[in-house]
């Protein structure tokens, strides 16, 4: 940590890596919830034109795909993996790619992924082959 940069009172954003260097936040697509045409594809682009610097260095990129009788939506945000999102733990937060996993939600089809490389929630991957055969 640079000596002239104060440690914060609430320590909210003074996150450091193992070497004590300040951890910088990553970039994520951040369009919140938008209608989507992504359906029955192995992967989709988010079509989100907004890339934001995540508010906190520990945050990762998240994408949530939901389909019900009326529409399909795709949500793109930054989120702290220590906290649940839509009541689910972000199990794959360390992944460099956003690999969609289905979650049980009544009345809809619900997939979610998280990842920790810049703008990684721009490309969301549904492919089962990718999940099982690709070591990344």
């Amino acid at each position: 940590i640079p000596p002239h940069v104060q440690k914060s009172v609430n320590n909210d954003m003074m996150v450091t890596d193992n070497n004590g260097a300040v951890k910088f936040p990553q970039l994520c697509k951040f369009c919140d919830v938008r209608f989507s045409t992504c359906d029955n594809q192995k992967s989709c682009l988010s079509n989100c034109s907004i890339t934001s610097i995540c508010e906190k260095p520990q945050e990762v990129c998240v994408a949530v795909w939901r389909k019900n009788d009326e529409n399909i939506t795709l949500e793109t945000v930054c989120h702290d993996p220590k906290l649940p999102y839509h009541d689910f733990i972000l199990e794959d937060a360390a992944s460099p790619k956003c690999i969609m996993k289905e979650k049980k939600k009544p009345g809809e089809t619900f997939f979610m992924c998280s990842c920790s490389s810049d703008e990684c929630n721009d490309n969301i991957i549904f492919s089962e082959e990718y999940n099982t055969s690709n070591p990344d």
């Epitope: 890596d17 070497n19 260097a21 300040v22 910088f24 970039l27 610097i53």
Partner: nanobody
Framework: EVQLLESGGGLVQPGGSLRLSCAAS???????QMWWVRQAPGKGLEFVS?????????YYANSVKGRFTISRDNSKNTLYLQMNSLRAEDTAVYYC???????????????WGQGTLVTVSS
């Protein structure tokens, strides 16, 4: 020796504008990823804006998007932050910083300036 020297801070009324500068030396400025980071009194760091090189792609925190503009002049080795529609919550010490990958995946060297104080108050 890497040096980053910020200037342009001061007292400004809400709704006003300021332009911060960061003069860089001791490294090849035009090839580096540069950031503006701020720290409000008693608070943590907030990462305001980033500009990449090459290409000059720019990124912003949601809190400043549409109000702040980051830019660079590689011929002058200078980074800028144009701040418009300033609010009381923008009051902070503003630092410029640079990041360079160490060559080990996911790790970086970072360098910081000494900061310049921006106070937004009527």
């Amino acid at each position: 020796e890497v040096q980053l020297l910020e200037s342009g801070g001061g007292l400004v009324q809400p709704g006003g504008s300021l332009r911060l500068s960061c003069a860089a030396s001791g490294f090849t400025f035009g090839t580096e990823q540069m950031w503006w980071v701020r720290q409000a009194p008693g608070k943590g760091l907030e990462f305001v804006s980033r500009i990449d090189s090459p290409g000059g792609r720019t990124y912003y925190a949601n809190s400043v998007k549409g109000r702040f503009t980051i830019s660079r002049d590689n011929s002058k080795n200078t980074l800028y932050l144009q701040m418009n529609s300033l609010r009381a919550e923008d009051t902070a010490v503003y630092y410029c910083a640079k990041r360079r990958p160490t060559g080990v995946s996911g790790t970086f060297y970072d360098y910081w300036g000494q900061g310049t104080l921006v106070t937004v108050s009527s």
